[in-house]
Interface confidence: medium
């Protein structure tokens, strides 16, 4: 399954993959 | 109830810049990216670019990067997009989308877009 | 970057099925949203991740996304149908794409 976007405020590596759970995208608010 | 709210049309001359706002209400603000999507006159939508709204922290096209600035004010729950160096083929309608949060990408809420015209 | 290619028109008599395709190189492993707007409006979710269906939406439409091609189906296609359909593409290489959008026209 493609991954999900993790919401704002999460940690993003620089092309929106998997981070802490896999398959989500980061919340608004993270570091990158 | 949910809506985002986008300011008025604008009239603008080649190599000015504009500032488009986009006032979110009935959600946490700070829960959502915040994209802008564009139309020109009887074409299809091209993304431009998204916000995060609680680091300020943006993601642009690479067809509006050096050109489009995004920016936020939390406390007012709003968020800006500024294009520079405007060019004809800049005349369009300009929407904010609201993105869902920890899904796929999808935009469950749009404003209603501000049209911007570019001429001499 | 992705190409998402669709049909420019697609017309149907009132009551058949629409089918609208968002074609793209493996679009099968992406995640796919249609989007429909109406003339002087902002676009609308419809369906999302390929085959969910958004709030308010009816059963009529539906989403199917494999290999390289994604279909939006609409049955018993209604007047008030008729609008711009636009495919639009997330994952994590190649940001937001939207495809060049379908106009359907529903006939009569």
């Known amino acids: 399954a493609p991954d999900t976007r993790p919401a704002p405020g999460s940690t993003a590596p620089p092309a929106h993959g998997v981070t802490s759970a896999p398959d989500t995208r980061p919340a608004p608010g993270s570091t990158a | 109830r949910m809506q985002l709210v986008q300011s008025g049309a604008e009239v603008k001359k080649p190599g000015a810049s504009v500032k488009l706002s986009c006032k979110a209400s009935g959600y946490t603000f700070a829960g959502h990216y915040m994209h802008w999507v564009r139309q020109a006159p009887g074409r299809g939508l091209e993304w431009m670019g998204w916000?995060?709204?609680?680091?300020?922290?943006?993601k642009y096209a690479q067809n509006f990067q050096g050109w489009v600035t995004m920016t936020r004010d939390t406390s007012i729950r709003t968020a800006y997009m500024e294009l520079s160096r405007l060019r004809s083929d800049d005349t369009a309608m300009y929407y904010c989308a609201r993105e869902v949060t920890g899904d796929r990408g999808q935009f469950d809420k749009w404003g209603q877009g501000t049209l911007v015209t570019v001429a001499s | 970057q992705s190409v998402l290619t669709q049909p420019p028109s697609v017309s149907v008599a009132p009551g058949k099925t629409a089918r609208i395709t968002c074609g793209g190189n493996?679009?099968?492993?992406?995640?796919v949203h249609w989007y429909q707007q109406k003339p002087g409006q902002a676009p609308v979710l419809v369906i999302y991740y390929g085959s969910d269906r958004s709030s308010g939406i009816p059963e009529r439409f539906s989403g199917s996304n494999s290999g390289n091609t994604a279909t939006l189906t609409i049955s018993r296609v209604e007047a008030g149908d008729e609008a711009d359909y636009y495919c639009q593409v997330w994952d994590s290489s190649s940001d937001w794409v939207f495809g060049g959008g379908t106009k359907l026209t529903v006939l009569g």
């Open positions: 493996n679009i099968g492993s992406k995640s």
């Open positions: 916000i995060d709204p609680v680091t300020g922290g943006t």
